[in-house]
């Protein structure tokens, strides 16, 4: 997913809606305007605000890289929701590419887990029922296995 | 002429409370948003928090629960009450007219506060 | 909370020389930041805001640029006047976010 970025707020455009602040806050879907007077809204997939602030632009909406898929439409108050694609996954310490998923398991382990769009296949030793590391085994090693389907 | 003017500092013991005032000419601060920022000797500015011009107030972390942003239209005063005072409170308090998208634009000349025992 | 990181804290530069200050924000502010200018036991006063913008009475050497999370005061011929300490602050979201002020820089002349 691209870096969330902030768009420059812009004059209100006459199908923008607009309001009073309330306690000097205007609601989801909106922004202050530039001299705190008034609320204006986002624009529907282009930008949005998911609490209540003061913020003078809404932030810009996030594009799903090629790679992914959207599952959810960014509108004035949610974020676009993007997912990584069938056999590739997002790992939480590199949220900013999708990885693809392993096709097996090393030699002496056993499937466990399936490839999902946050997770890559979860291997474990046959005997002890230990997990695997994660790295990435030696092609002589694998065991292939169609996603889905337990290694044998 | 618009101006701030902020008076209610001195020496003060530690644990004590003292009110600070911001006197406004030239314009009503009821109808800006209004600042108080703080500057401890030989440091950098600091802010403390703000009331908007409906009478909300919302504060730095570091002020919670001890500050107090109120103003008093009919004086057009702003004020900071400051409780349980600290010597890490020292400093000169300044107040001063915040204008959302312009900035701080107006400011006062502060008043010095001392906590000492 | 948004962070304010300014560089460098202190400057040594001559009279006539080109001076840069820069802000970086943690988190993007658009272009709504200002830049103030304090002397030794005075109060603050704005240079510029919304990034670019001089402030009434401002002399034209000053100036501001940057958007997203980096800014940068340029003074283009540094006066003698010119010493003092500049600070940057955020203009957006003050009551979500806070408004801290940068660390400041301290321009000397040499």
């Known amino acids: 997913i691209t870096q969330q970025d902030l768009a420059p707020q812009q004059r209100a455009a006459p199908q923008q809606k607009r309001s009073s602040p309330s306690e000097g806050l205007c609601p989801p879907g909106h922004h202050i305007s530039e001299d705190g007077r008034d609320c204006i809204s986002c624009k529907y997939g282009q930008d949005y605000s998911t609490h209540w602030n003061d913020l003078l632009f809404c932030l810009r909406c996030t594009r799903c890289d090629s790679g992914e898929v959207e599952l959810s439409p960014c509108t004035t108050t949610r974020n676009t929701v993007c997912q990584c694609e069938e056999g590739t996954f997002r790992e939480e310490d590199s949220p900013e590419m999708c990885r693809k998923c392993r096709t097996g398991c090393p030699r002496g382990m056993v499937k466990v887990g399936d490839c999902t769009p946050w997770s890559d296949i979860e291997c474990v030793h046959k005997e002890s029922g230990t997990k695997h590391s994660g790295e990435v085994p030696a092609v002589e090693e694998t065991v292939t296995s169609s996603p889905g389907t337990p290694a044998s | 002429e618009v101006q701030l003017v902020e008076t209610g500092g001195g020496l003060i013991q530690p644990g004590g409370s003292l009110r600070l005032s911001c006197a406004a000419s030239?314009?009503?601060?009821?109808?800006?948003?209004m600042i108080w920022v703080r500057q401890a000797p030989g440091k950098g500015l600091e802010y403390i928090g703000f009331?908007?011009?409906?009478?909300?107030?919302y504060y730095a972390d570091s002020a919670k629960g001890r500050f107090t942003i109120s103003r008093d239209n009919s004086k057009n005063t702003l004020y900071l009450q400051m409780n349980s005072l600290r010597a890490e409170d020292t400093a000169v308090y300044y107040c001063?007219?915040?204008?959302?998208?312009?900035?701080?634009?107006?400011w006062g000349r502060g008043t010095l506060v001392t906590v000492s025992s | 909370d948004i962070q304010m990181t300014q560089s460098p804290s202190s400057l040594s530069a001559s009279v006539g020389d080109r001076v840069t200050i820069t802000c970086r924000a943690s988190?993007?502010?658009?272009?709504?930041l200002s830049w103030y200018q304090q002397k030794p036991g005075k109060a603050p006063k704005r240079l510029i805001y919304?990034?670019?913008t001089l402030a009434s009475g401002v002399p034209s050497r000053f100036s501001g640029s940057g958007s997203g999370t980096d800014f940068t005061l340029t003074i283009s011929s540094l006066q003698p006047e010119d010493a003092a300490t500049y600070y940057c602050?955020?203009?957006?979201?003050?009551?979500?976010?806070?408004?801290?002020f940068g660390g400041g820089t301290k321009v000397e002349i040499k």
């Open positions: 001063a007219r915040y204008t959302y998208s312009d900035g701080t634009d107006l």
């Open positions: 919304k990034a670019s």
């Open positions: 988190q993007s502010i658009s272009t709504y």
């Open positions: 009331i908007t011009s409906d009478g909300s107030t």
């Open positions: 030239g314009f009503t601060v009821s109808r800006y948003a």
């Open positions: 602050q955020p203009n957006s979201g003050i009551a979500t976010y806070g408004a801290a």
